[in-house]
Amino acid sequence: MMTGTIETTGNISAKKGGSVILQCHLSSTMAQVTQVNWEQHDHSLLAIRNAELGWHIYPAFKDRVAPGPGLGLTLQSLTMNDTGEYFCTYHTYPDGTYRGRIFLEVLESSVAEHSARFQIP
């Protein structure tokens, strides 16, 4: 029986040209995490992190994707095209597969600064 739950950073926004950390966390299960896959909004793979073999980054993203922190992924030099859904897929033993979703909105620098300036503390 799958008892675990995936917690994610949820909906996040970041500045164009900046960077953002995508994080998922699996809790409430003793299952062994054998691999975490990170997928983009078009369901293409960005990276794989195997528990023994480590990180394997898709070549097209090598310059813009940094592994970590932890099982997370850091996206750098953000463009407007990076806006969309991201998925973390946890492959575990013996539970099976858990999946989390993050929505990233990339904002034009001026818009991001403007919205940040008028946030209620």
């Epitope: 896959n37 794989i48 195997n50 528990a51 073999l53 480590g54 898709y58 492959h91």
Partner: antibody, heavy 114, light 107 residues
């Protein structure tokens, strides 16, 4: 040049044990996860063990779990596969493989037969 | 476990021919597919990873492609030295699994 040289194979009786070794050179061994992949007489490939770069985590399929142990000695650039309670179906060529399978050794042959 | 099926155990070809070796995954493995070549008496060698990226030193006559769960290794103009066993492998999910192999031989 990346080199992986396996040794330790041979003929062993069912229920017996064998320890395979792999000497690595030409790369920073301690930076890579490593695996053992076997090729059965009918040419099928099966991943039988993987180990993290620092040796802190291992993974073995159910077919060999409890019978095989993978280990490494980063000081000596060596990978090991301890095999016990061997069965006839373990007969295969065993390859030492680097990382995401980018370099393979020449293999060492294991025959389990009475 | 994900099953990788190479339906052709043998494929006959001639030097200069274009040949496509196929592999079907039992579920979507995205682009997490590699292809290996094994010549007689040798160990397997990585040709393609991430479905379409050639490994160092691999001639550009080898290309990999994907259409949903169907994965294909194409040799644009077969050379005599290409006669070998070819395997696909998925690394989308553990345990990583290999296809049964396709032997490329001369007609």
């Amino acid at each position: 040049e990346v080199q992986l040289v396996e040794s330790g194979g041979g003929l062993v009786q069912p229920g017996g044990s064998l320890k395979l070794s792999c000497a690595a050179s030409g790369f920073t061994f301690s930076s890579y996860g490593m695996s053992w992949v076997r090729q059965t007489p009918d040419k099928r490939l099966e991943l039988v063990a993987t180990i993290k770069s620092d040796g802190g985590s291992t993974n073995l399929p159910d077919s060999v779990k409890g019978r095989f142990t993978i280990s490494r000695d980063n000081a000596k650039n060596t990978l090991h596969l301890q095999m016990s309670s061997l069965k006839s179906e373990d007969t295969a060529m065993y390859y030492c493989v680097r990382g995401y399978f980018d370099y393979w050794g020449q293999g060492t042959s294991v025959t389990v037969s009475s | 476990d994900i099953v990788m099926t190479q339906s052709h155990k043998f494929m006959s070809t001639s030097v200069g021919d274009r040949v496509s070796i196929t592999c079907k995954a039992s579920q979507d493995v995205k682009t997490a597919v590699a292809w290996y070549q094994q010549k007689p008496g040798q160990s397997p060698k990585l040709l393609i990873y991430w479905s379409s990226t050639r490994h160092t030193g691999v001639p550009d006559r080898f290309t990999g492609s994907r259409s949903l769960t169907d994965h294909t290794l194409t040799i644009s103009s077969v050379q005599a030295e290409d006669l070998a066993l070819y395997y696909c492998q998925q690394y989308y999910s553990t345990p990583y699994t290999f296809g049964g192999g396709t032997k490329l031989e001369l007609k």
